[in-house]
C-alpha cells in the first residue's frame, strides 16, 4: 500500500488457513423459529458417521434438538441457541460444514415487498452484544507503513445498546497515550489513528459490553518503518499472456512503496523499424497513468478489451517514487480465434474470450 492511504482492517478479506470452508454460512433466525442446518456429503459421496458440535461441544439429541447425519434441527429456537455450529466427521473430526447462527428476539417476519408498511419494527434484539456483520470480522493482522491512517471497526448491537471501549496490549487505551491522539467514533464503532509510528505497534482490542454480556475482538498492528528505497514490484507480475483474437486481457502489477508511488503502464513500439532510440532508450507509448480520480489499486491493473493482433507485444509496468524507478515487463501473444487453445507457456495464462 502506498503512503498516506487509509488502512481499514475489519472486512478486508483475509486468507483462511486450512481447508477452504466453502460451506460456511452466517444465518439469522427469529425467536421461536426452527433452526434447520443441512450438510450434504462432499462430492455427493457417502457421509460416514458424523457429529454435530455447537461452540466446540458435542450436541446432545433431545425432543427439541433433532440430530441426523446430514441435518440438524433445533425447534423453538431462543437466544441461547445462537453460536457456531459445525458438522464433523466422527473419526477424523474434519469439519464438513460450518454455520454461524444468530437467534434474535424478533420473530422473523415476511418481506414487505413494496415498503408500504411504515410501522416501527418493535422486535429489537434484546440481550448480550453481537457483531452485526460477523462475516466481516475475519482479519486479525494488519501491517502498514509508517505515516498511514489506521481504522479498526467493531460494529455491534444488543439491547440495551452496548458500549465500546478499546485496549492496547490489554490496557485501557486513551488519546493521551499517543502523540496525535486518537479518534473514537462510537456510533461507527471505530478507532482511528492518523499518521501511525512504530510505537503504535501492538494488540488492539475492542470490548463491546452491556449488562447481559461482553464480546471482544483483537487486532494486531505492525507499523513498517520507512525505508528509503525505490518501489518494489512483486515477482512474476505482470505475467506473460496468450490470448485469442477478440478476447479480454488483464495485466497485474503489485507495487510496494513507502513513498507515494507513481505508476504507469507502457507499451513498447517501433519507430522507423527501430525499438530503441539513439541513446538506447526503448520507444514506448503511455497506456495508463494517474488521473484525478484514479486510485493506486486501479493503476495496478491494465485491462485490454477485444484484443487485436496490433495489441501483441511487450508491456511494462513502471513505478517510481522520490527515490527511484522500478519496472517489470511481460509479453502478450495474440492468436487467431479459430485456434483451439489448450495451454499456454509456463509463465502465461490463456483467455478464451
Amino acid at each position: 500500500e502506498s503512503l498516506g492511504t487509509e488502512q481499514r482492517v475489519v472486512g478486508r478479506v483475509a486468507e483462511v488457513s486450512g481447508p477452504e470452508p466453502s460451506q460456511q454460512e452466517q444465518l439469522v433466525f427469529g425467536s421461536g423459529d426452527a433452526v434447520e442446518l443441512s450438510c450434504p456429503p462432499p462430492g455427493g459421496g457417502p457421509m460416514g458417521p458424523t457429529v454435530w458440535v455447537k461452540d466446540g461441544a458435542g450436541l446432545v439429541p433431545s425432543e427439541r434438538v433433532l440430530v441426523g447425519p446430514q441435518r440438524l434441527q433445533v425447534l423453538n429456537a431462543s437466544h441461547e441457541d445462537s453460536g457456531a455450529y459445525s458438522c464433523r466427521q466422527r473419526l477424523t473430526q474434519l469439519v464438513l460444514c460450518h454455520f454461524s447462527v444468530r437467534v434474535t428476539d424478533a420473530p422473523s417476519s415476511g418481506d414487505d415487498e413494496d415498503g408500504e408498511d411504515e410501522a416501527e419494527d418493535t422486535g429489537v434484539d434484546t440481550g448480550a452484544p453481537y457483531w452485526t456483520r460477523p462475516e466481516r470480522m475475519d482479519k486479525k493482522l494488519l501491517a502498514v507503513p509508517a505515516a498511514n491512517t489506521v481504522r479498526f471497526r467493531c460494529p455491534a448491537a444488543g439491547n440495551p445498546t452496548p458500549s465500546i471501549s478499546w485496549l492496547k496490549n490489554g490496557k485501557e487505551f486513551r488519546g493521551e497515550h499517543r502523540i496525535g491522539g486518537i479518534k473514537l467514533r462510537h456510533q461507527q464503532w471505530s478507532l482511528v489513528m492518523e499518521s501511525v509510528v512504530p510505537s503504535d505497534r501492538g494488540n488492539y482490542t475492542c470490548v463491546v459490553e452491556n449488562k447481559f454480556g461482553s464480546i471482544r475482538q483483537t487486532y494486531t498492528l505492525d507499523v513498517l518503518e520507512r525505508s528509503p528505497h525505490r518501489p518494489i514490484l512483486q515477482a512474476g507480475l505482470p505475467a506473460n499472456q496468450t490470448a485469442v483474437l477478440g478476447s479480454d486481457v488483464e495485466f497485474h502489477c503489485k507495487v510496494y512503496s513507502d513513498a507515494q508511488p507513481h505508476i504507469q503502464w507502457l507499451k513498447h513500439v517501433e519507430v522507423n523499424g527501430s525499438k530503441v532510440g539513439p541513446d538506447g532508450t526503448p520507444y514506448v507509448t503511455v497506456l495508463k497513468t494517474a488521473g484525478a480520480n484514479t486510485t493506486d489499486k486501479e493503476l495496478e491493473v491494465l485491462s485490454l478489451h477485444n484484443v487485436t493482433f496490433e495489441d501483441a507485444g511487450e508491456y511494462t509496468c513502471l513505478a517510481g517514487n522520490s527515490i527511484g524507478f522500478s519496472h517489470h515487463s511481460a509479453w502478450l501473444v495474440v492468436l487467431p480465434a479459430e485456434e483451439e487453445l489448450v495451454e499456454a507457456d509456463e509463465a502465461g495464462s490463456v483467455y478464451a474470450g
Epitope: G11, V16, Q26, T132, R153, E298
Partner: antibody, heavy 118, light 107 residues
Framework: EVQLQQSGPDLVKPGASVKISCKAS????????MNWVKQSHGKSLEWIGD????????TYNQKFKDKATLTVDKSSSTAYMELRSLTSEDSAVYYC???????????WGQGTTLTVSS | DIVMTQSHKFMSTSVGDRVSITCKAS??????VAWYQQKPGQSPQLLIY???TRHTGVPDRFTGSGSGTDYILTIRSVQAEDLALYYC?????????FGAGTKLELK
C-alpha cells in the same frame, strides 16, 4: 477502471435453475466482498447475500437461503449466483456489487434480467 | 430484519432547489446508512456511506446526515441530471436492507 460485467438476459421455464455470472476486472478481486441484489420490476432492492472471494465463505439473507447459491472462481475473477426451483416470482433484474469493509456497494454490475415463463 | 422506510415515494423539485430525502430505520443503525442514485435502465450508484461520507467522485452538492433511526440525503442545488430514484440502505447489520425508494421529479 473497475468493471463488473454480468452475463446476458435469460428466459427460463418454471422449475428450472439458472446460473448468473459476474466477471470482475480493474481491481484485485480478493480485496472485496461480492454482494448480490434482486430488483423486481418497479420495486425496490433486496439483498440476497455475499461471498468472500478468498475462501468462499457466504452469508445469505434468510429469505434467499433456499433459492440462491453463491460461488466464486478466483482464477477467472468471476462470481456466480445459481437460482433454483424458479417461479415467476423470481423474474427480476439481478445485480452483483462489490463492497470493502462495511462501506456500501461502491461498484455494481450492469444487471442481468431473468424472466421465468412457460 | 431492519425495515428502512422512505416516507415519500415521489418528491417534486425545480432545478436549483434544495431538497431533502428522508429515511427512517425501524431500529438504531448506528449511522450505518448508505444512499444510492438509480436512473432508468441503469444500475444504482453509491453516493453516501456511513450516513455522511461522500463516495469518491460524488459532487459536493450531495450531503448525508443523521443518526440513530433518522437519516437525510440533501441535494443542495438540484441539477437536471439529479432527477432519479434514490434508495437508502442500512449496511450496519445483516441482512442488509433497502428503503422502497424516493423518485425525484420536476415540478
Amino acid at each position: 477502471e473497475v468493471q463488473l460485467q454480468q452475463s446476458g438476459p435469460d428466459l427460463v421455464k418454471p422449475g428450472a435453475s439458472v446460473k448468473i455470472s459476474c466477471k470482475a476486472s480493474g481491481y484485485t478481486v480478493t480485496d472485496y466482498y461480492m454482494n448480490w441484489v434482486k430488483q423486481s420490476h418497479g420495486k425496490s432492492l433486496e439483498w440476497i447475500g455475499d461471498i468472500n472471494p478468498n475462501n468462499g465463505v457466504t452469508t445469505y439473507n434468510q429469505k434467499f437461503k433456499d433459492k440462491a447459491t453463491l460461488t466464486v472462481d478466483k482464477s477467472s475473477s468471476t462470481a456466480y449466483m445459481e437460482l433454483r426451483s424458479l417461479t415467476s416470482e423470481d423474474s427480476a433484474v439481478y445485480y452483483c456489487a462489490r463492497e470493502e469493509d462495511f462501506d456500501g456497494f461502491d461498484y455494481w454490475g450492469q444487471g442481468t434480467t431473468l424472466t421465468v415463463s412457460s | 430484519d431492519i425495515v428502512m422506510t422512505q416516507s415519500h415515494k415521489f418528491m417534486s423539485t425545480s432545478v436549483g432547489d434544495r431538497v431533502s430525502i428522508t429515511c427512517k430505520a425501524s431500529q438504531d443503525v448506528s449511522t450505518g446508512v448508505a444512499w444510492y442514485q438509480q436512473k432508468p435502465g441503469q444500475s444504482p450508484q453509491l453516493l453516501i456511506y456511513w450516513a455522511s461520507t461522500r463516495h469518491t467522485g460524488v459532487p459536493d452538492r450531495f450531503t448525508g446526515s443523521g443518526s440513530g433511526t433518522d437519516y437525510i440525503l440533501t441535494i443542495r442545488s438540484v441539477q437536471a441530471e439529479d432527477l432519479a430514484l434514490y434508495y437508502c440502505q442500512q449496511h450496519y447489520s445483516t441482512p442488509l436492507t433497502f428503503g422502497a425508494g424516493t423518485k425525484l421529479e420536476l415540478k
